[in-house]
Interface confidence: low
């Protein structure tokens, strides 16, 4: 039976915040989240004709139906899931750092390893187009993750959000069970943008509803006059739409979807830059650990040779061509580029009535062989998850005690 769950600290928290400061750091309620950023940067006639659905997901091609398995990034023999990436040379140093920190967070918490592109068939290309958007799951070939400079101004949260899409995850607030936990205020939504709130029909949600998921949109998403479009039902004051880090549930979902465990053989360090890269990636690839070290070394001493302390050559930008190559196809996101994007995940349909384009993406279940239901005598005996509320997971899984404004601490 649904009831709100507030994350709490067992033991001492490794991170604390001054009173009144949310874990989003500088992100106040007035700061722009993904929908607002994209509305400001991408000029479209109508949501129906847009190449984006739900505000930041590249509309999947109706011509490419992939199986659930092929939509996941493949796991290597060592239990590590490698996602090759190219990082555009157009990013300045601070922007690159923000992106790399987000990639590193996945390495710290999950079995996902973002490795530099080395002619792999399937890879993501992270480029500063107009807006923050990506596709859901692995599409095959090159797939675009757009992170405009505005998407990076408030830290790594939006990067994490888009990378969760890349790994195969949809938005929290469009879950099939969302009506138990949030109220969608349809009258407050920008006319024509209601499509962004259509529920998923998938029942494969892996963990209970999580208000603190990095995949949850904020209260004002697609608001027409600054009033909430999303209202949490369980706790009026709970914060939604955090863009700070992966919540505990976000991490659990990644581990469940990919059927893996988080830690590699090396012990995890402390702090935002100390992290384990786990088992080594493919020999040809340069690990994020070394990239971060190299970047740090680069910023400390401008070595003209471009070599890191260990003598390894560092490319002009992590995962990019030394010449800053960028595919001409990326100059504009055309219908063809859109058609390259992944069909969603396969088996239970994610219906999108009124989505405009014929044969709009049918989501497919990520869960191929993973059951989210216990063995029970009746199929009706499904378990109803309780939503998680409160803060996202901070280092060590802790939550600042003062984050629950006006709420009692559990």
């Amino acid at each position: 039976l649904g009831a709100p769950l507030a994350s709490s600290c067992a033991g001492a928290c490794g991170t604390s915040f001054p009173d009144g400061l949310t874990p989003e750091g500088t992100q106040a309620s007035g700061d722009k989240d993904i929908p607002a950023i994209n509305q400001g940067l991408i000029l479209e006639e109508t949501p129906e004709s847009s190449f984006l659905i739900e505000g930041d997901i590249i509309r999947p091609s109706p011509f490419r139906l992939l199986s659930a398995t092929s939509n996941k990034w493949p796991m290597g023999g060592s239990g590590v899931v490698e996602v090759p990436f190219l990082l555009s040379s157009k990013y300045d140093e601070p922007s690159r750092q923000v992106i790399l920190e987000a990639l590193a967070e996945f390495e710290r918490s999950t079995c996902i390893r973002f490795v530099t592109y080395q002619d792999q068939r399937d890879f993501i290309s992270i480029i500063p187009m107009y807006g923050c958007f990506s596709s859901v799951g692995r599409s095959g070939g090159m797939q675009v993750v757009s992170l405009a400079p505005t998407c990076l101004q408030k830290g790594r949260g939006i990067v994490l959000h888009e990378l969760m899409h890349v790994l195969g995850f949809w938005h929290e607030h469009t879950r099939a069970d969302r009506d138990r936990y949030i109220r969608v205020n349809w009258n407050e939504i920008l006319p024509g943008f209601e499509i962004n709130f259509i529920k998923s029909q998938s029942s494969n949600m892996l963990t209970p509803y999580d208000y603190s998921s990095v995949m949850h949109y904020g209260r004002l998403a697609f608001s027409r006059r600054g009033l909430p479009t999303i209202t949490p039902l369980w706790a009026p004051s709970v914060h939604i739409g955090q863009r700070w880090n992966l919540s505990a549930s976000d991490i659990t979902r990644v581990l469940k979807l990919y059927g893996c465990s988080p830690s590699g053989p090396r012990p995890r360090g402390r702090g935002s830059h100390a992290h384990s890269t786990g088992r080594s990636p493919a020999p040809a690839s340069l690990s994020l650990q070394r990239l971060l070290e190299a970047l740090s070394a680069e910023s400390r001493s401008p070595d003209p040779s471009g070599s890191s302390a260990g003598g390894q050559p560092v490319p002009a930008g992590p995962g990019e061509s030394p010449h800053g190559w960028e595919s001409p196809a990326l100059k504009k996101l055309s219908a063809e580029a859109s058609a390259r994007q992944p069909q969603t995940l396969a088996s239970s349909p994610r219906s999108r009535p009124g989505a405009g384009a014929p044969g709009v993406a049918q989501e497919q279940s990520w869960l191929a062989g993973v059951s989210t239901k216990p063995t029970v005598p009746s199929s009706e005996a499904g378990i109803q998850p309780v939503p998680v509320q409160g803060s996202p997971a901070l280092p060590g899984g802790c939550v600042p005690r003062n984050h629950f404004k006006g709420m009692s601490e559990d």
Partner: antibody, heavy 116, light 112 residues
Framework: EVQLQQSGPELVKPGSSVKISCKPS????????MVWMKQSHGKSLEWIGA????????TYNQKFKGKATLTVDKSSSTAYMELRSLTSEDSAVYYC?????????WGQGTLVTVSA | DVLMTQIPLSLPVSLGDQASISCRSS???????????LEWYLQKPGQSPKLLIY???NRFSGVPDRFSGSGSGTDFTLKISRVEAEDLGVYYC?????????FGSGTKLEIK
């Protein structure tokens, strides 16, 4: 088959604490939240609260805040409830149940008796 | 908190008779998602409660069709068309729409 095995009866002194356990089987422990209920002798049932096994997040019935603390141990797939500052009012049978849209499965109950 | 009031507290019946138990909530338990999370449980002496009916009128797996639930808003009823010996025990209604979730005080079904 879904089953919930609760720890045995407890006889405790007033003012002390007790920690009772609930170990489910037949489904993945971290997939669903665990709910706890209290039933005093000859009386009705009361909902104490729920815990999310993934991250330890909890929600409580206001009446039991400060009295009950819910925890989980993911490594052993076990849920726990600690009751503190016990009085005779806390003498009851305590049940755990996975958090379904309805309580399809219950533990057998743990009898806690508070007596000097 | 939502108060769940059951009537009667005790219901003496003869085997084969029809039995009817009423449950009234202090406020509507229609959830904002359109569902009414009203359940009925039977508890026999020395046992844990067993689910009979969920969401007002849905029989749980394995529950005989002589049990039926009805109602809406604040008034709900459990009917047993022909009482059998195994039906004896205490019946509880329960609302799961508003936190904290609450049970009724119980109705004891006993042989007349």
């Amino acid at each position: 088959e879904v089953q919930l095995q609760q720890s045995g009866p407890e006889l405790v002194k007033p003012g002390s604490s007790v920690k009772i356990s609930c170990k489910p089987s037949g489904y993945t422990f971290t997939d669903y939240n665990m709910v706890w209920m209290k039933q005093s002798h000859g009386k009705s049932l009361e909902w104490i609260g729920a815990i999310n096994p993934n991250n330890g997040g909890t929600t409580y019935n206001q009446k039991f805040k400060g009295k009950a603390t819910l925890t989980v141990d993911k490594s052993s797939s076990t849920a726990y409830m600690e009751l503190r500052s016990l009085t005779s009012e806390d003498s009851a049978v305590y049940y755990c149940a996975p958090n379904w849209d309805w309580f399809a499965y219950w533990g057998q109950g743990t009898l806690v008796t508070v007596s000097a | 908190d939502v108060l769940m009031t059951q009537i009667p507290l005790s219901l003496p019946v003869s085997l084969g008779d029809q039995a009817s138990i009423s449950c009234r909530s202090s406020q509507s338990i229609l959830h904002s998602n359109g569902n009414t999370y009203l359940e009925w449980y039977l508890q026999k002496p020395g046992q844990s409660p067993k689910l009979l009916i969920y969401k007002v009128s849905n029989r749980f797996s394995g529950v005989p069709d002589r049990f039926s639930g009805s109602g809406s808003g604040t008034d709900f009823t459990l009917k047993i068309s022909r009482v059998e010996a195994e039906d004896l025990g205490v019946y509880y209604c329960f609302q799961g729409s508003h936190v904290p979730f609450t049970f009724g005080s119980g109705t004891k079904l006993e042989i007349k």
